[in-house]
Amino acid sequence: KESCDVQLYIKRQSEHSILAGDPFELECPVKYCANRPHVTWCKLNGTTCVKLEDRQTSWKEEKNISFFILHFEPVLPNDNGSYRCSANFQSNLIESHSTTLRVTDVKSASERPSKDEMASRFWA
Protein backbone atom coordinates (compact mmCIF):
# COMPACT_ATOMS: atom_id res chain seq x y z
CA LYS A 1 0.00 0.00 0.00
CA GLU A 2 1.27 3.49 -0.86
CA SER A 3 2.66 5.78 1.83
CA CYS A 4 0.24 8.48 2.97
CA ASP A 5 2.97 11.02 3.62
CA VAL A 6 2.60 14.29 1.74
CA GLN A 7 5.21 14.66 -1.00
CA LEU A 8 5.99 17.64 -3.21
CA TYR A 9 7.44 16.68 -6.57
CA ILE A 10 9.08 19.78 -7.96
CA LYS A 11 12.06 18.51 -9.91
CA ARG A 12 15.38 19.30 -8.33
CA GLN A 13 17.25 22.09 -10.19
CA SER A 14 14.42 22.47 -12.69
CA GLU A 15 14.23 25.61 -14.81
CA HIS A 16 11.55 27.17 -17.00
CA SER A 17 12.42 29.66 -19.73
CA ILE A 18 9.43 31.94 -20.25
CA LEU A 19 8.56 35.22 -21.95
CA ALA A 20 7.50 38.38 -20.16
CA GLY A 21 3.96 39.24 -21.15
CA ASP A 22 2.85 35.62 -21.52
CA PRO A 23 0.64 33.79 -19.02
CA PHE A 24 2.35 30.95 -17.15
CA GLU A 25 1.33 28.37 -14.57
CA LEU A 26 4.02 27.15 -12.19
CA GLU A 27 3.07 23.68 -11.02
CA CYS A 28 3.70 22.06 -7.66
CA PRO A 29 2.64 18.40 -7.91
CA VAL A 30 1.30 17.40 -4.48
CA LYS A 31 0.83 13.76 -3.47
CA TYR A 32 -1.48 13.23 -0.50
CA CYS A 33 -4.07 10.74 0.66
CA ALA A 34 -7.25 11.76 2.49
CA ASN A 35 -6.88 15.37 3.56
CA ARG A 36 -5.48 17.93 1.17
CA PRO A 37 -2.66 19.82 2.92
CA HIS A 38 -2.34 23.58 3.11
CA VAL A 39 0.19 24.54 0.43
CA THR A 40 1.89 27.88 -0.17
CA TRP A 41 4.38 29.32 -2.63
CA CYS A 42 7.38 31.45 -1.76
CA LYS A 43 10.13 33.19 -3.76
CA LEU A 44 13.75 32.82 -2.73
CA ASN A 45 15.57 35.98 -1.71
CA GLY A 46 19.05 35.00 -0.65
CA THR A 47 18.69 32.39 2.10
CA THR A 48 15.09 33.29 2.92
CA CYS A 49 11.97 32.34 1.04
CA VAL A 50 9.41 35.15 0.95
CA LYS A 51 5.83 33.91 1.11
CA LEU A 52 3.68 34.96 -1.88
CA GLU A 53 0.45 35.76 -0.11
CA ASP A 54 -1.08 38.20 -2.58
CA ARG A 55 -0.62 36.08 -5.70
CA GLN A 56 -3.27 34.09 -7.50
CA THR A 57 -3.07 30.36 -6.78
CA SER A 58 -5.38 27.44 -7.46
CA TRP A 59 -5.65 23.68 -7.23
CA LYS A 60 -5.83 21.54 -10.36
CA GLU A 61 -6.74 17.85 -10.41
CA GLU A 62 -5.71 15.96 -13.51
CA LYS A 63 -5.47 12.19 -14.08
CA ASN A 64 -5.26 11.44 -10.34
CA ILE A 65 -2.54 14.05 -9.87
CA SER A 66 -3.02 17.17 -7.75
CA PHE A 67 -1.22 20.39 -8.57
CA PHE A 68 -1.00 23.59 -6.56
CA ILE A 69 -0.60 26.27 -9.21
CA LEU A 70 1.03 29.69 -8.97
CA HIS A 71 -0.43 31.87 -11.72
CA PHE A 72 1.51 34.50 -13.64
CA GLU A 73 -0.97 36.58 -15.66
CA PRO A 74 1.10 37.90 -17.25
CA VAL A 75 4.73 37.07 -16.52
CA LEU A 76 6.69 40.20 -15.54
CA PRO A 77 10.46 40.68 -15.84
CA ASN A 78 10.83 40.77 -12.05
CA ASP A 79 9.23 37.32 -11.79
CA ASN A 80 12.68 36.02 -12.71
CA GLY A 81 14.07 33.92 -9.86
CA SER A 82 13.64 30.75 -7.82
CA TYR A 83 10.44 29.50 -6.19
CA ARG A 84 9.50 26.80 -3.73
CA CYS A 85 6.22 25.32 -2.56
CA SER A 86 5.63 24.18 1.01
CA ALA A 87 2.96 22.06 2.64
CA ASN A 88 1.71 21.90 6.21
CA PHE A 89 0.81 18.34 7.12
CA GLN A 90 0.21 17.00 10.63
CA SER A 91 2.14 19.92 12.13
CA ASN A 92 5.09 19.23 9.84
CA LEU A 93 6.39 21.66 7.23
CA ILE A 94 7.39 19.93 3.99
CA GLU A 95 9.40 21.98 1.50
CA SER A 96 9.91 21.25 -2.16
CA HIS A 97 13.08 21.62 -4.15
CA SER A 98 13.36 25.04 -5.74
CA THR A 99 12.49 25.70 -9.36
CA THR A 100 13.81 28.63 -11.37
CA LEU A 101 12.00 30.91 -13.79
CA ARG A 102 14.21 32.52 -16.42
CA VAL A 103 12.23 35.41 -17.81
CA THR A 104 13.10 36.94 -21.16
CA ASP A 105 11.90 40.53 -21.47
CA VAL A 106 10.42 40.76 -24.97
CA LYS A 107 11.29 44.47 -25.13
CA SER A 108 14.96 43.49 -25.12
CA ALA A 109 14.51 40.73 -27.66
CA SER A 110 15.03 41.78 -31.27
CA GLU A 111 12.38 39.35 -32.48
CA ARG A 112 9.76 37.59 -30.39
CA PRO A 113 10.30 33.82 -30.74
CA SER A 114 7.49 31.31 -30.48
CA LYS A 115 6.95 29.50 -27.18
CA ASP A 116 8.36 26.28 -28.59
CA GLU A 117 11.41 28.06 -30.00
CA MET A 118 11.98 29.59 -26.58
CA ALA A 119 11.52 26.27 -24.87
CA SER A 120 13.86 24.37 -27.11
CA ARG A 121 16.75 26.83 -27.17
CA PHE A 122 19.87 24.84 -26.66
CA TRP A 123 22.93 25.83 -24.69
CA ALA A 124 26.02 23.74 -25.43
Epitope: Q7, Y9, K11, E15, I18, I65, I94, D116, M118, A119
Partner: antibody, heavy 118, light 111 residues
Protein backbone atom coordinates in the same frame (compact mmCIF):
# COMPACT_ATOMS: atom_id res chain seq x y z
CA UNK B 1 -4.32 4.91 -23.14
CA UNK B 2 -1.03 6.75 -23.52
CA UNK B 3 1.03 5.57 -26.48
CA UNK B 4 4.44 6.68 -27.74
CA UNK B 5 5.96 5.83 -31.11
CA UNK B 6 9.52 6.54 -32.23
CA UNK B 7 10.38 7.10 -35.87
CA UNK B 8 13.56 7.91 -37.73
CA UNK B 9 16.35 6.38 -39.78
CA UNK B 10 17.76 2.95 -39.00
CA UNK B 11 21.17 3.72 -40.53
CA UNK B 12 23.25 6.87 -40.22
CA UNK B 13 26.81 7.51 -41.36
CA UNK B 14 29.51 8.61 -38.90
CA UNK B 15 29.74 12.42 -38.40
CA UNK B 16 26.13 12.88 -39.56
CA UNK B 17 23.20 14.10 -37.44
CA UNK B 18 20.60 11.71 -36.05
CA UNK B 19 17.02 13.02 -35.91
CA UNK B 20 14.28 11.02 -34.20
CA UNK B 21 10.60 11.80 -33.61
CA UNK B 22 8.40 10.62 -30.75
CA UNK B 23 4.68 10.85 -31.53
CA UNK B 24 2.43 10.85 -28.47
CA UNK B 25 -1.24 9.93 -28.29
CA UNK B 26 -3.50 9.73 -25.24
CA UNK B 27 -1.75 12.56 -23.36
CA UNK B 28 -0.55 16.07 -24.06
CA UNK B 29 3.16 16.83 -24.09
CA UNK B 30 2.26 20.08 -22.33
CA UNK B 31 1.92 17.99 -19.17
CA UNK B 32 4.58 15.82 -17.48
CA UNK B 33 8.13 15.16 -18.67
CA UNK B 34 9.08 13.52 -21.96
CA UNK B 35 12.33 11.58 -22.16
CA UNK B 36 14.80 9.91 -24.46
CA UNK B 37 16.69 6.78 -23.37
CA UNK B 38 18.94 4.47 -25.34
CA UNK B 39 20.06 0.87 -24.90
CA UNK B 40 23.46 -0.16 -26.20
CA UNK B 41 24.20 -3.57 -27.72
CA UNK B 42 25.78 -4.69 -24.43
CA UNK B 43 22.40 -4.06 -22.70
CA UNK B 44 23.45 -0.88 -20.87
CA UNK B 45 20.64 1.70 -20.58
CA UNK B 46 21.60 5.38 -20.79
CA UNK B 47 19.35 8.30 -19.95
CA UNK B 48 19.71 11.05 -22.54
CA UNK B 49 17.45 13.89 -21.40
CA UNK B 50 13.95 15.32 -21.29
CA UNK B 51 11.70 18.13 -22.39
CA UNK B 52 9.21 19.25 -19.75
CA UNK B 53 5.61 20.40 -19.85
CA UNK B 54 6.80 24.01 -20.10
CA UNK B 55 9.30 23.21 -22.85
CA UNK B 56 12.37 23.41 -20.62
CA UNK B 57 15.03 20.81 -21.33
CA UNK B 58 17.64 18.77 -19.50
CA UNK B 59 20.48 16.88 -21.17
CA UNK B 60 22.77 14.24 -19.75
CA UNK B 61 26.15 16.03 -19.37
CA UNK B 62 27.82 13.14 -21.20
CA UNK B 63 25.92 14.24 -24.34
CA UNK B 64 25.40 17.94 -23.71
CA UNK B 65 27.59 19.25 -26.52
CA UNK B 66 25.80 17.08 -29.13
CA UNK B 67 22.17 16.78 -28.10
CA UNK B 68 19.04 18.84 -28.49
CA UNK B 69 15.42 18.00 -27.63
CA UNK B 70 12.62 20.07 -29.11
CA UNK B 71 8.88 19.74 -29.53
CA UNK B 72 5.87 20.65 -31.63
CA UNK B 73 2.88 20.99 -29.33
CA UNK B 74 0.37 21.25 -32.19
CA UNK B 75 1.51 17.84 -33.51
CA UNK B 76 2.01 16.45 -29.98
CA UNK B 77 5.48 15.31 -30.97
CA UNK B 78 8.91 15.77 -29.51
CA UNK B 79 12.26 15.28 -31.16
CA UNK B 80 15.80 14.15 -30.50
CA UNK B 81 18.73 15.51 -32.45
CA UNK B 82 22.18 14.04 -31.89
CA UNK B 83 25.06 15.62 -33.78
CA UNK B 84 28.37 14.14 -34.95
CA UNK B 85 27.35 10.53 -34.40
CA UNK B 86 29.94 7.76 -34.17
CA UNK B 87 29.69 3.98 -34.10
CA UNK B 88 29.41 4.33 -30.30
CA UNK B 89 25.92 5.78 -30.84
CA UNK B 90 24.67 2.50 -32.29
CA UNK B 91 21.77 1.61 -29.96
CA UNK B 92 18.03 1.17 -29.62
CA UNK B 93 16.45 4.55 -28.87
CA UNK B 94 13.32 4.83 -26.72
CA UNK B 95 11.03 7.70 -25.84
CA UNK B 96 9.16 7.54 -22.54
CA UNK B 97 6.91 9.60 -20.28
CA UNK B 98 7.85 10.44 -16.69
CA UNK B 99 5.13 10.40 -14.05
CA UNK B 100 4.87 13.60 -11.99
CA UNK B 101 4.93 11.70 -8.68
CA UNK B 102 8.51 10.49 -8.81
CA UNK B 103 9.53 10.75 -12.48
CA UNK B 104 9.48 6.99 -13.12
CA UNK B 105 8.85 6.01 -16.74
CA UNK B 106 5.31 4.67 -16.89
CA UNK B 107 4.87 4.62 -20.67
CA UNK B 108 7.51 3.74 -23.27
CA UNK B 109 7.69 3.61 -27.02
CA UNK B 110 8.63 0.30 -28.66
CA UNK B 111 12.05 1.65 -29.59
CA UNK B 112 13.85 2.25 -32.85
CA UNK B 113 17.15 0.60 -33.66
CA UNK B 114 19.92 2.78 -35.02
CA UNK B 115 23.14 1.59 -36.62
CA UNK B 116 25.96 4.04 -37.23
CA UNK B 117 28.13 2.74 -40.03
CA UNK B 118 29.85 4.01 -43.16
CA UNK C 1 26.31 10.81 -11.23
CA UNK C 2 24.67 8.27 -8.92
CA UNK C 3 26.03 4.83 -9.77
CA UNK C 4 23.65 1.89 -9.35
CA UNK C 5 25.29 -1.50 -8.86
CA UNK C 6 23.02 -4.47 -9.45
CA UNK C 7 23.76 -7.96 -8.23
CA UNK C 8 23.86 -10.64 -9.32
CA UNK C 9 24.46 -9.98 -13.02
CA UNK C 10 22.61 -13.20 -13.81
CA UNK C 11 20.41 -15.50 -11.81
CA UNK C 12 19.00 -18.98 -12.43
CA UNK C 13 16.00 -19.91 -10.28
CA UNK C 14 13.73 -22.94 -10.25
CA UNK C 15 10.06 -22.45 -11.04
CA UNK C 16 8.12 -21.68 -7.88
CA UNK C 17 11.19 -20.46 -6.00
CA UNK C 18 12.14 -16.94 -4.90
CA UNK C 19 14.38 -14.62 -6.92
CA UNK C 20 16.06 -11.69 -5.16
CA UNK C 21 17.85 -8.90 -7.02
CA UNK C 22 19.83 -6.20 -5.23
CA UNK C 23 20.53 -2.62 -6.28
CA UNK C 24 23.04 -0.51 -4.35
CA UNK C 25 23.33 3.24 -4.94
CA UNK C 26 26.55 5.23 -4.60
CA UNK C 27 24.59 8.02 -2.86
CA UNK C 28 21.47 8.17 -0.71
CA UNK C 29 18.23 8.20 -2.71
CA UNK C 30 15.98 10.32 -0.48
CA UNK C 31 16.10 14.00 -1.42
CA UNK C 32 12.33 14.13 -2.00
CA UNK C 33 11.53 12.59 1.38
CA UNK C 34 10.74 9.55 -0.70
CA UNK C 35 12.87 6.85 -2.33
CA UNK C 36 12.84 7.54 -6.07
CA UNK C 37 14.09 4.07 -7.00
CA UNK C 38 12.17 2.08 -9.57
CA UNK C 39 12.34 -1.40 -11.16
CA UNK C 40 11.74 -2.41 -14.78
CA UNK C 41 11.47 -5.71 -16.60
CA UNK C 42 12.71 -5.98 -20.17
CA UNK C 43 12.04 -8.97 -22.38
CA UNK C 44 13.86 -9.56 -25.67
CA UNK C 45 12.65 -7.21 -28.41
CA UNK C 46 10.42 -5.20 -26.07
CA UNK C 47 10.80 -1.88 -24.25
CA UNK C 48 11.33 -1.87 -20.50
CA UNK C 49 8.14 -2.29 -18.47
CA UNK C 50 7.59 -0.59 -15.12
CA UNK C 51 7.14 -3.06 -12.27
CA UNK C 52 7.78 -1.15 -9.04
CA UNK C 53 7.90 2.62 -8.51
CA UNK C 54 9.18 4.63 -5.57
CA UNK C 55 10.93 1.59 -4.06
CA UNK C 56 7.91 -0.44 -3.00
CA UNK C 57 4.77 0.47 -4.99
CA UNK C 58 3.42 -2.12 -7.40
CA UNK C 59 2.50 -0.72 -10.81
CA UNK C 60 -1.08 -1.33 -11.89
CA UNK C 61 -1.51 -4.65 -13.70
CA UNK C 62 1.71 -6.18 -12.33
CA UNK C 63 1.24 -9.46 -10.42
CA UNK C 64 1.71 -9.35 -6.64
CA UNK C 65 4.51 -11.91 -7.04
CA UNK C 66 6.70 -8.85 -7.62
CA UNK C 67 7.65 -6.72 -4.64
CA UNK C 68 10.18 -4.02 -3.89
CA UNK C 69 11.79 -2.90 -0.67
CA UNK C 70 14.66 -0.83 0.66
CA UNK C 71 15.66 2.74 1.38
CA UNK C 72 18.60 5.14 1.28
CA UNK C 73 21.25 3.18 -0.65
CA UNK C 74 20.07 -0.46 -0.62
CA UNK C 75 17.07 -1.69 -2.58
CA UNK C 76 15.71 -5.12 -3.45
CA UNK C 77 13.37 -6.58 -6.05
CA UNK C 78 11.81 -9.91 -5.08
CA UNK C 79 9.88 -12.28 -7.33
CA UNK C 80 8.10 -15.01 -5.40
CA UNK C 81 7.17 -17.44 -6.78
CA UNK C 82 9.06 -17.27 -10.07
CA UNK C 83 7.10 -18.24 -13.19
CA UNK C 84 8.32 -19.14 -16.68
CA UNK C 85 7.06 -15.80 -18.01
CA UNK C 86 9.49 -13.94 -15.73
CA UNK C 87 12.51 -14.74 -17.91
CA UNK C 88 13.85 -11.27 -18.68
CA UNK C 89 16.45 -8.68 -17.71
CA UNK C 90 15.59 -6.53 -14.69
CA UNK C 91 16.86 -2.99 -14.17
CA UNK C 92 16.77 -0.59 -11.25
CA UNK C 93 16.61 3.15 -11.94
CA UNK C 94 16.99 6.24 -9.77
CA UNK C 95 15.24 9.53 -10.54
CA UNK C 96 16.35 11.33 -7.39
CA UNK C 97 19.09 13.25 -9.14
CA UNK C 98 19.91 14.27 -12.70
CA UNK C 99 21.11 12.55 -14.74
CA UNK C 100 18.81 9.65 -14.04
CA UNK C 101 20.77 6.41 -14.03
CA UNK C 102 20.08 2.70 -14.45
CA UNK C 103 21.68 -0.36 -12.94
CA UNK C 104 23.59 -2.71 -15.21
CA UNK C 105 20.76 -5.23 -15.30
CA UNK C 106 20.16 -8.70 -13.91
CA UNK C 107 19.32 -11.50 -16.33
CA UNK C 108 16.84 -13.98 -14.84
CA UNK C 109 16.76 -17.51 -16.22
CA UNK C 110 14.88 -20.63 -15.21
CA UNK C 111 16.97 -23.46 -13.74
Amino acid sequence: EVQLQESGPSLVKPSQTLSLTCSVTGDSITSAYWNWIRKFPGNKLEYMGYISYSGSTYFNPSLKSRISITRNTSKNQYYLQLNSVTTEDTATYYCARSHYYGYYFDYWGHGTTLTVSS
Amino acid sequence: DIVLTQSPASLAVSLGQRATISCRASETIDSYGDSLMHWYQQKAGQPPKLLIYRASNLESGIPARFSGSGSRTDFTLTINPVEADDVATYYCQQTDEDPYTFGGGTKLEIK
